[in-house]
């Protein structure tokens, strides 16, 4: 089915992480020769949606007026030209927040930590969940930062940081999720401000423990559990 045509570009506005009930628009941009655009959702029994191109025919709009769990998932798009269907776009992972009640985020022993010491961020949910994510505000790609290991359902996950440097300072939130769909997240926890003091001679994080690894366009959020953590925060089950 895939032909020699170049792959289109797929993106979501205002973003790919959407709260329940909010609207989102998915865009697929191909070429001026496009006659039709098709949006496929992973493991769906039929094309998710098909649209005629908007003038000047190089893109199509797929509208979701109100985000629900039906729409959460992994998408690709294609366009059809007179010579056939294009290659698939890179995947877009559309994540819905608000599927479960919000967890609680705390810092042990304290959110005030001296550089070089250790701190553990603790994400706790009221009901047992099997995935916990920690995100940092204004990070390059927040949802790629951390995921706890997949295992038996738990009420909490620990995210230890050691040694703490000034780079670790900032505002964090956590989410919880069930393993059957990593595209459905809880409401975000209330924010936790981590304040790092005494940043004299901060040890530089080693490359394997960098805190803010920038993610490329193909590094979509919520890869399968077990992927390399994109943060110095180690993933650990309580």
């Amino acid at each position: 089915q895939a032909g020699p045509l170049p792959k289109p570009t797929l993106w979501a506005e205002p973003g790919s992480v959407i709260s329940w009930g909010n609207s989102v628009t998915i865009w697929c941009q191909g070429t001026l020769e496009a006659r039709e655009y098709r949006l496929d959702k992973e493991e769906s029994p039929a094309p998710w949606d098909r649209q005629n191109p908007l003038e000047p025919k190089n893109k199509a709009r797929f509208s979701i007026p109100s985000m629900t769990e039906d729409y959460a998932g992994r998408y690709r798009c294609y366009y059809r030209s007179p010579v056939g269907w294009s290659q698939p776009s890179d995947p877009l992972e559309l994540v819905m927040t608000g599927a479960y009640s919000k967890p609680t985020l705390s810092a042990l022993p304290s959110p005030l930590v001296t550089s070089g010491k250790s701190v553990t961020l603790l994400c706790q949910s009221r009901s047992p969940m099997d995935t916990f994510l920690l995100i940092k505000e204004r990070a390059a790609h927040p949802l790629l930062h951390l995921r706890s290991e997949h295992g038996a359902q738990q009420h909490q996950a620990e995210f230890p940081m050691s040694p703490v440097t000034s780079v670790h300072g900032g505002t964090y939130r956590c989410f919880s999720s069930h393993g059957f769909s990593h595209y459905l997240l809880s409401h975000p926890s209330d924010p936790l401000e981590l304040i790092v003091s005494g940043s004299l001679e901060d040890p530089r994080p080693s490359p394997t423990r960098s805190v803010s690894t920038a993610a490329g366009p193909e590094d979509q959020p919520l890869m399968p559990t077990g992927s390399v953590p994109h943060s110095g925060l180690r993933r650990h089950w309580e």
């Epitope: 949006l39 769906s44 094309p47 949606d49 269907w85 059957f180």
Partner: antibody
Framework: QVQLVESGGGVVQPGRSLRLSCATS????????MHWVRQAPGKGLEWVAL????????YYADSVKGRFTISRDNSKNTLYLQLNSLRAEDTAVYFC???????????????WGQGTLVTVSS | DAVVTQESALTTSPGETVTLTCRSS?????????ANWVQEKPDHLFTGLIG???NRVPGVPARFSGSLIGDRAALTITGAQTEDEAIYFC?????????FGGGTKLTVL
């Protein structure tokens, strides 16, 4: 109005082949996916195969995988099912049913044909 | 392989509300199973009723509605009528294939 008419059924010996057809009218065939579903005598429904609107994707039940082939000719508004290596347990009435244009437009299995009987017997 | 289970038979009276359910052997039915409901009347007369858990086929009376109840898909007939006497099949999608349930014979007495 939407019409689906199956043909090609009959009595066939085990191990032999048969080709079923489903002629359609009343809708834009090339825009819709299509299914084959079967019902053994006195039994429930068993889904057999699905083909997308452009023929680009096909899916099969494990029980027929490697033996049956679903195809379509959009210029003739016709759906086909090639049945090879037939077994006694393939005896059933075979129905074609319409799928959707897309998941956000339409409902799968909305229209059905009247069926064609395939009997596999020596 | 997944098995889809339905009540084998249910009886209701005209005007009553009746709910048919559809259970999956793999766990809870989710939106990703795109639950469908099909009605069979005598002489192999099949009609689609509901798709994607809750979307009604155009022309199907509003008394038919689909939902998820607990870990099952459900078809509810609110104010059953004598012409609703039929066999009802649910179908669930499992990533790359559909599976039909065994059907529920609904009697409206």
């Amino acid at each position: 109005q939407v019409q689906l008419v199956e043909s090609g059924g009959g009595v066939v010996q085990p191990g032999r082949s048969l080709r079923l057809s489903c002629a359609t009218s009343g809708f834009t065939f090339s825009s819709y996916g299509m299914h084959w579903v079967r019902q053994a005598p006195g039994k429930g429904l068993e889904w057999v195969a699905l083909i997308w609107f452009d023929g680009g994707n096909q899916y099969y039940a494990d029980s027929v995988k490697g033996r049956f082939t679903i195809s379509r000719d959009n210029s003739k508004n016709t759906l086909y099912l090639q049945l090879n290596s037939l077994r006694a347990e393939d005896t059933a009435v075979y129905f074609c049913a319409r799928d959707v244009i897309s998941m956000v437009r339409g409902v799968p299995f909305d229209y059905w044909g009247q069926g064609t009987l395939v009997t596999v017997s020596s | 392989d997944a098995v889809v289970t339905q009540e084998s038979a249910l009886t209701t009276s005209p005007g009553e509300t009746v709910t048919l359910t559809c259970r999956s052997s793999t766990g809870a039915v989710t939106t990703g199973n795109y639950a469908n409901w099909v009605q069979e009347k005598p002489d192999h007369l099949f009609t689609g009723l509901i798709g994607g858990i809750k979307n009604r086929v155009p022309g199907v009376p509003a008394r038919f509605s689909g939902s998820l109840i607990g870990d099952r898909a459900a078809l509810t007939i609110t104010g059953a009528q004598t012409e609703d006497e039929a066999i009802y099949f649910c179908a669930l999608w499992y990533s790359n294939h559909w599976v039909f349930g065994g059907g529920t014979k609904l009697t409206v007495l």
